[in-house]
Interface confidence: low
Amino acid sequence: IPVIEPSVPELVVKPGATVTLRCVGNGSVEWDGPPSPHWTLYSDGSSSILSTNNATFQNTGTYRCTEPGDPLGGSAAIHLYVKDPARPWNVLAQEVVVFEDQDALLPCLLTDPVLEAGVSLVRVRGRPLMRHTNYSFSPWHGFTIHRAKFIQSQDYQCSALMGGRKVMSISIRLKVQKVIPGPPALTLVPAELVRIRGEAAQIVCSASSVDVNFDVFLQHNNTKLAIPQQSDFHNNRYQKVLTLNLDQVDFQHAGNYSCVASNVQGKHSTSMFFRVVESAYLNLSSEQNLIQEVTVGEGLNLKVMVEAYPGLQGFNWTYLGPFSDHQPEPKLANATTKDTYRHTFTLSLPRLKPSEAGRYSFLARNPGGWRALTFELTLRYPPEVSVIWTFINGSGTLLCAASGYPQPNVTWLQCSGHTDRCDEAQVLQVWDDPYPEVLSQEPFHKVTVQSLLTVETLEHNQTYECRAHNSVGSGSWAFIPISAGAHTHPPDE
């Protein structure tokens, strides 16, 4: 670490005095201090002498000696006071610029340490400091305003009491700049716009920032638009608003509009699309298949997407039959708006009953007319089976009726013994009926099929079983040829 002679932390001299400051280090050394006149510098290797024959108040300040070659970067300092009775202050800078919430050092250096007790900071023309100004004083460095605020951007003077009167420094202008967190905040309203040719339209591009220095413009496709700008200041933010008013839109007004704002921190932009149409439109669509199949007892949500301009004047869900004249309950119909011109309408059908199969239509109306989208809902049922013994053309025949949806497949089994259901060990014979006769097949109803099994003689210690199955489940009926009749087995889900 270099050493300074005289080896005192502070030195007080009178104006006109000769001052010699000598710094010695292991290697070459350098002086650093306030810019002031009359200093002469002599250097020879490891020592450097700073001297003046005519010290003035402007030589007041801290002089630091450093050794550039020292890896530890050590330094030594001495503070020089040149106590001029007429000049209590040496001001090192007349303008100080800081960001908000930083400490602002106003570098008025006291030329006489004795005056420290009577110093104060004031605004120019003797005005007091603003309330809540938190500051401290160091005779070596000056006044520090802690956590400076934008409104503290003022002209200040340092005041010292000399012989009962206040002596002011020259003024120091403090500029406290707002910390700009980033590019201006932007809004572009609306986010999307549709108009019929000839209608009026308005697009508003607004930007705001804590600092007034920012630019904003509205761009249509690649055209930068010249629009009168409105400026405002509220909630501690500067706001610039561009309002594009179009009395009668035409197709050339359509396209992409970008609101762009920029400041020193960068650029923000947001875009919207303006669509101009020849006439009102109303489009209905669904991501679902319009033909729906659901197992009885389960639930279903029917969804319709609507794209419309102008807005809808009416909409509803309607049940078109064929079973009952019930209409969907309004509480089961739900609407959500994705954005201004697109909506989703949902009809919830929980725990579907047989009477709720059929056609459901969503109807919507706007100035463009009526549109409807119709769903066909078919319920799926597991097969129900029954078997009877009869004679057809003189032949004994087992007749199996199976009812369900989708159309059931039929299999006959003959097994030994009397049982409610044939198991593999008992099975004597199996017949698949690939083409059972369809007895009824109406839309939204179960399909009923009939299968015939001709039996010359009924074996009395055997069971004949008709099994039916579809994608939902299976059902069976066991026929036991005894005088008591037949046993049935309920459908399996």
Partner: antibody, heavy 124, light 109 residues
Framework: QVQLVESGGGLVRPGGSLRLSCAAS????????MSWVRQAPGKGLEWVSA????????NYADSVKGRFTISRDNAKNSLYLQMNSLRAEDTALYYC?????????????????WGQGTLVTVSS | QAGLTQPPSVSVAPGQTARITCGGN??????VHWYQQKPGQAPVLVVY???DRPSGIPERFSGSNSGNTATLTISRVEAGDEADYYC???????????FGGGTQLTVLR
């Protein structure tokens, strides 16, 4: 004082090329679209080409499409017109002009500030 | 691309009112701009947006536009107004700037 100064004109043979420049001063160049307009001796004004403020969009009169190319360098406050395959009918005084694109009530464009022009003569 | 029709010449005595027309199909739906060009000089914008005046242009210059005709009106004509006058529109469909053929205004001595 807003100023546009054209340069690069001269005498050129049919089929030849020229590059016109327009230097802008005293206004925010990149706020404006720019246009080239020409005037044949003793004739009226004919719009030639335009370029948007950021160079993203260009368009041309049918008479020069495919032969002329408009470009700009906002960093240098300069506008250019590259003219290839020149014909005798391209002989004219060529003006550059700052083009204001307005969208207030209606969309429209007009030419606000004009340079003094540079003369292009195409002759064998 | 619609053409704009201007009379080749208009003559007026000093102090009188000059009216220069610019015809075009449904020109009233477009915005019309007017330029003045004196001999040997570049054109100067005198009216834009049908009826607005740039700063520095005397109030004597005014414009109107409706139907199929736009009109530039110069009241209290002075000798210094003698020039060629051009109307201009922006053809939206082609994105081209279109000029009229020009009208030579003569101030009678």
């Amino acid at each position: 004082q807003v100023q546009l100064v054209e340069s690069g004109g001269g005498l050129v043979r049919p089929g030849g090329s020229l590059r016109l420049s327009c230097a802008a001063s005293e206004f925010t160049f990149d706020d404006y679209a720019m246009s080239w307009v020409r005037q044949a001796p003793g004739k009226g004004l004919e719009w030639v080409s335009a370029i948007s403020w950021n160079g993203g969009s260009t368009n041309y009169a049918d008479s020069v499409k495919g032969r002329f190319t408009i470009s700009r360098d906002n960093a240098k406050n300069s506008l250019y017109l590259q003219m290839n395959s020149l014909r005798a009918e391209d002989t004219a005084l060529y003006y550059c002009a700052s083009t204001v694109e307005v969208a207030h009530r209606r969309l429209y464009k007009y030419l606000e500030v004009w340079g003094q022009g540079t003369l292009v003569t195409v002759s064998s | 691309q619609a053409g704009l029709t201007q009379p080749p010449s208009v003559s007026v005595a000093p102090g009188q009112t000059a009216r220069i027309t610019c015809g075009g199909n449904n020109i009233g739906s477009k915005s019309v701009h007017w330029y003045q060009q004196k001999p040997g000089q570049a054109p100067v914008l005198v009216v834009y947006g049908d009826s607005d005046r740039p700063s520095g242009i005397p109030e004597r210059f005014s414009g109107s536009n409706s139907g199929n005709t736009a009109t530039l009106t110069i009241s209290r004509v002075e000798a210094g107004d003698e020039a060629d006058y051009y109307c201009q529109v922006w053809d939206i469909s082609s994105d081209h700037v279109v000029f009229g053929g020009g009208t030579q205004l003569t101030v009678l001595r």
